[in-house]
């Protein structure tokens, strides 16, 4: 069976084709080659001689047991080599010779027992080394690591490392890899020698499900003393063994580390006193809790010095009390419990993401809700009922506002966005908004992107609601049940580049409303019920138009519509997916491509 | 279409068939077997994925006695610092995991329950596997 040509001469997918040898019928120019799940078993020298341009080679699960010297010789452009799931028994010293550009080596689940005899010391370009899910017992980083000066990611998770000694990291003292991210999760650790990490700098250290008791965790974290780490991730996994006990003593050792960002990811334990628990983390710049249960929500009003707080997929009794002077970014998403939003006091806040919480807001939105006048980004999408009772007084700095898939109330009672002269991006898609007031978008003089799909308009008619949006470049009016529009609805949108009118209910096409759209490049009228044109002769669309989508409409392919059908043919160079422009009527022409019709008036009169 | 039996409990019989062409082998064990009136147990899965499990989610299409419920999307792996350790599993890496589950207080009417599970993962998104579970429910007291 032949390989699948994904990109001609470049990318070939030969997965699971029962190949016993490397195929020799693929072009020399091949850059990406997937040979995974083939029983190759043995790689001799110059195995890939026919593919000198290879950049990515996937050999996952190829039952490879032996890799000989120079197996990859000639692959001087290879940047990614994947060997996952091969039961390697014999790896020659020169197995990886010739890989002068290799940046990513994945040797997950390859029976690797030690880094010491892994022959990769010459791979100076290596950025990522993934040796997870192996049999490595020692964390000693061999001397050859001093050659790997570009290494940024080292994944040693799911190995057999139990202890870390001072001598294990000696090589990092000699040549500090300032950007190294290290994942040691799922190693059964019980000892870290104090001083082992002293004066070591890491970009990221991940330790999840490493400790089988609170005491072990406590002593191991104390063993990290002296480490300077940009981002520290601690925690567990839901499907692995979890700690039976967890208290403030667990993290006391963190006081002896220098940490810029901290994350606790999944803990099968109720956190009650977070002030004591995170006592050593009051001054990290970014603090993050993922998938934890928090009992006492008042604790977030303590004087933590965090600039970024992230609470994701957590459980709360009620919406937390948030009073944090220095906080600039708050991400509070996909959380459970506390369904009603309560005011927060965050005077420095610039970025607020409250999406996907099922929250309801009794009154939105003004400075008093968030306790800040500095807010630039606000995401309230995928929540419950949000009642608009104020038009963003004190929030005039906003540039990005997202309400999609929340249920907005009182949107047509006053000019909700009147204060937002700096707003650039607004998404009110699928918010149950019924536009019944022409001043709905008044004030949005800087707006560039407006997404309002999935809403509705009074009498299914689009009125002149965009008159102030002179900077608008993107407008989505899809799925709005629109049937008619004001001939001057778009007259002020001279900067508009993309207009989506798809999935509405137009019976006819009219070019007149678009005559002022001098910058329009994309117009999507797909999934309407267009049968013909409006009475008058169709004019040309603006000359800037490059893409016109009229697919999945109800074209009436009869003689009376000859001029419209001819006009469509004349637009051929603009039309996208023309094969999906089909006649709907009459019955003998149903399903025929509109552009293949011979439009002469022998069509049945 | 070959049917794979999972288990029987006091009020349910569970089996599955593949609903994709690939039919890559997957081993599923439930211990103890699910009882629909209330249940607590362990789900054990052994599987070698044909693509990375990063950003794994399930589309669930549930049918209750021929009545279709709306499609449900269950996100399992968000993409970074995920809850489950198998979210970091790579294409070709053995996934051998045990997941605990529990539910209570749901009353099910007698009949045939079908659940099509479409597993989608990776970037770009592609189907990982598709299984159609059939649960025959025989409540002892309803």
């Amino acid at each position: 069976e032949p390989c699948v040509e994904v990109v001609p001469n470049i990318t070939y997918q030969c997965m699971e084709l029962n190949f016993y040898k490397i195929p020799d019928n693929l072009p020399f120019s091949t850059k990406n080659l997937d040979l995974s799940f083939n029983p190759l078993r043995h790689l001799g020298s110059y195995s890939f001689f026919s593919f000198p341009e290879l950049q990515v080679l996937d050999l996952s699960r190829c039952e490879i047991q032996t890799i000989e010297d120079g197996a990859y010789q000639s692959l001087s452009h290879l940047s990614t080599l994947i060997l996952t799931g091969n039961p390697i028994q014999s790896l020659a010293l020169g197995a990886f010779s010739g890989l002068s550009s290799l940046q990513k080596l994945v040797a997950v689940e390859t029976n690797l027992a030690s880094l010491e005899n892994f022959p990769i010391g010459h791979l100076k370009t290596l950025k990522e080394l993934n040796v997870a899910h192996n049999l490595i017992q020692s964390f000693k980083l061999p001397e050859y690591f001093s050659n790997l000066t570009n290494l940024e990611h080292l994944d040693l998770s799911s190995n057999k490392i139990q202890s870390i000694y001072c001598t294990d990291l000696r090589v990092l003292h000699q040549m500090p890899l300032l950007n190294l991210s290290l994942d040691l999760s799922l190693n059964p650790m019980n000892f870290i020698q104090p001083g082992a990490f002293k004066e070591i700098r890491l970009h990221k250290l991940t330790l999840r499900n490493n400790f089988d008791s609170l005491n072990v965790m406590k002593t191991c974290i104390q063993g990290l003393a002296g480490l300077e780490v940009h981002r520290l991730v601690l925690g567990e996994f839901r499907n692995e063994g979890n700690l039976e006990k967890f208290d403030k003593s667990a993290l006391e050792g963190l006081c002896n580390l220098t940490i810029e960002e901290f994350r606790l990811a999944y803990l099968d334990y109720y956190l009650d006193d977070i002030i004591d628990l995170f006592n050593c983390l009051t001054n990290v710049s970014s603090f993050s809790l993922v998938s934890v249960t928090i009992e006492r929500v008042k604790d977030f009003s303590y004087n933590f010095g965090w600039q970024h707080l992230e609470l994701v997929n957590c459980k709360f009794g009620q919406f937390p009390t948030l009073k944090l002077k220095s906080l600039k970014r708050l991400t509070f998403t996909s959380n459970k419990g506390g369904n009603a939003f309560s005011e927060v006091d965050l005077p420095s806040l610039e970025f607020l993401d409250l999406s996907r919480n099922g929250l309801s807001f009794k009154g939105c939105c003004s400075q008093s809700d968030f306790g800040t006048t500095s807010l630039k980004y606000l995401d309230l999408s995928f929540n419950g009922v949000i009642t608009m009772s104020s038009n963003f007084l004190g929030l005039e700095q906003l540039e990005h506002l997202d309400f999609q898939h929340s249920n907005l109330k009182q949107m047509s009672e006053f000019s909700v966005f009147l204060s937002l002269r700096n707003l650039i991006y607004l998404d009110i898609s699928h918010t149950h908004t019924r536009v019944a007031f022409n001043g709905i978008f008044n004030g949005l003089s800087s707006l560039e992107v407006l997404k309002m799909a999935g809403n509705s308009f009074q009498e299914n008619f689009l009125p002149d609601i965009f008159t102030e949006l002179r900077n608008l470049t993107f407008l989505d009016l899809s799925q709005c049940q629109l049937e008619q529009l004001s001939p001057t609805a778009f007259n002020s949108l001279s900067s508009l580049q993309v207009l989506n009118m798809s999935h509405n209910n137009f019976f006819s096409l009219d070019t007149f409303p678009y005559k002022c759209l001098n910058s329009l490049q994309v117009l999507d009228y797909s999934l309407n019920h267009i049968m013909t044109s409006k009475k008058q002769e169709l004019q040309h669309f603006p000359s800037s138009l490059a893409f016109l989508n009229l697919t999945q409409n109800d074209f009436a392919c009869t003689c009376e519509h000859q001029s419209f059908l001819q006009w469509i043919k004349d637009q051929r160079q603009l039309l996208v997916e023309v094969e999906r422009m089909e006649c709907a009527t009459p019955s003998d022409k149903q399903g025929m491509p509109v552009l293949s019709l011979n439009i002469t008036c022998q069509m049945n009169k | 279409q070959k049917q794979y039996w999972v288990c029987n409990s006091s009020d349910a019989s569970i089996s599955y068939t593949y609903c994709d062409k690939m039919q890559y082998p997957i081993s599923i064990n439930v211990n103890p077997c699910i009882e629909l009136k209330r249940s607590k147990g362990l789900l054990h899965i052994f599987y070698i994925p044909r693509r990375d499990l990063k950003q794994l989610y399930f589309n669930l299409y549930i049918t209750v006695n021929t009545m279709n419920l709306p499609k449900r999307k269950e996100v399992i792996c968000r993409g970074s610092d995920d809850d489950y350790s198998f979210c970091r599993a790579l294409k070709g890496e053995t996934v051998n995991t045990t997941i605990s589950f529990s539910f209570k207080g749901i009353k099910f009417s007698k009949g045939k329950y079908k659940c099509v599970v479409e597993a989608i993962s990776g970037s770009p998104e592609e189907m990982l596997f598709c299984l159609e579970f059939v649960i025959l429910h025989q409540p002892n007291s309803n």
């Epitope: 008619q484 019976f507 999934l527 709907a584 | -």
Partner: nanobody
Framework: EVQLVESGGGLVQAGGSLRLSCVAS????????MGWFRQAPGKERDIVAR????????YYAESVRGRFTISRDNAKNTVYLQMNSLRPEDTAVYYC????????????WGQGTQVTVSS
């Protein structure tokens, strides 16, 4: 399942009038487009008129424009076709059609009602 039942057809003299009715049952179709097609002997089936759920938009084939009027009563789940100034060439079987609530065009069809215009 949606069912469309037409009534009101019959024999009429040229210049006369008829009013066709179509009742939808099985589910409410108040938001979907509905319409009338016709098929004359030896000819293909073609659209005569169409009306949106809101009654705001209508479409008429050129041959009936000014003579036929489509309307609907959503409370009664009914669509009508008032046919005036009938001509012999209007003789056909008239079919009621409805889109699906998901927006698929011409999804549901009635059995048809015969209209015969004698000269």
């Amino acid at each position: 399942e949606v069912q469309l039942v037409e009534s009101g057809g019959g024999l009429v003299q040229a210049g006369g009038s008829l009013r066709l009715s179509c009742v939808a049952s099985g589910r409410t179709l108040s938001t979907v487009n509905m319409g009338w097609f016709r098929q004359a002997p030896g000819k293909e089936r073609d659209i005569v008129a169409r009306i949106s759920g809101s009654s705001i938009s209508t479409y008429y084939a050129e041959s009936v424009r000014g003579r036929f009027t489509i309307s609907r009563d959503n409370a009664k789940n009914t669509v009508y076709l008032q046919m005036n100034s009938l001509r012999p060439e209007d003789t056909a079987v008239y079919y009621c059609v409805a889109d699906s609530p998901g927006g698929r065009s011409y999804e549901y069809w009635g059995q048809g009602t015969q209209v015969t215009v004698s000269s």
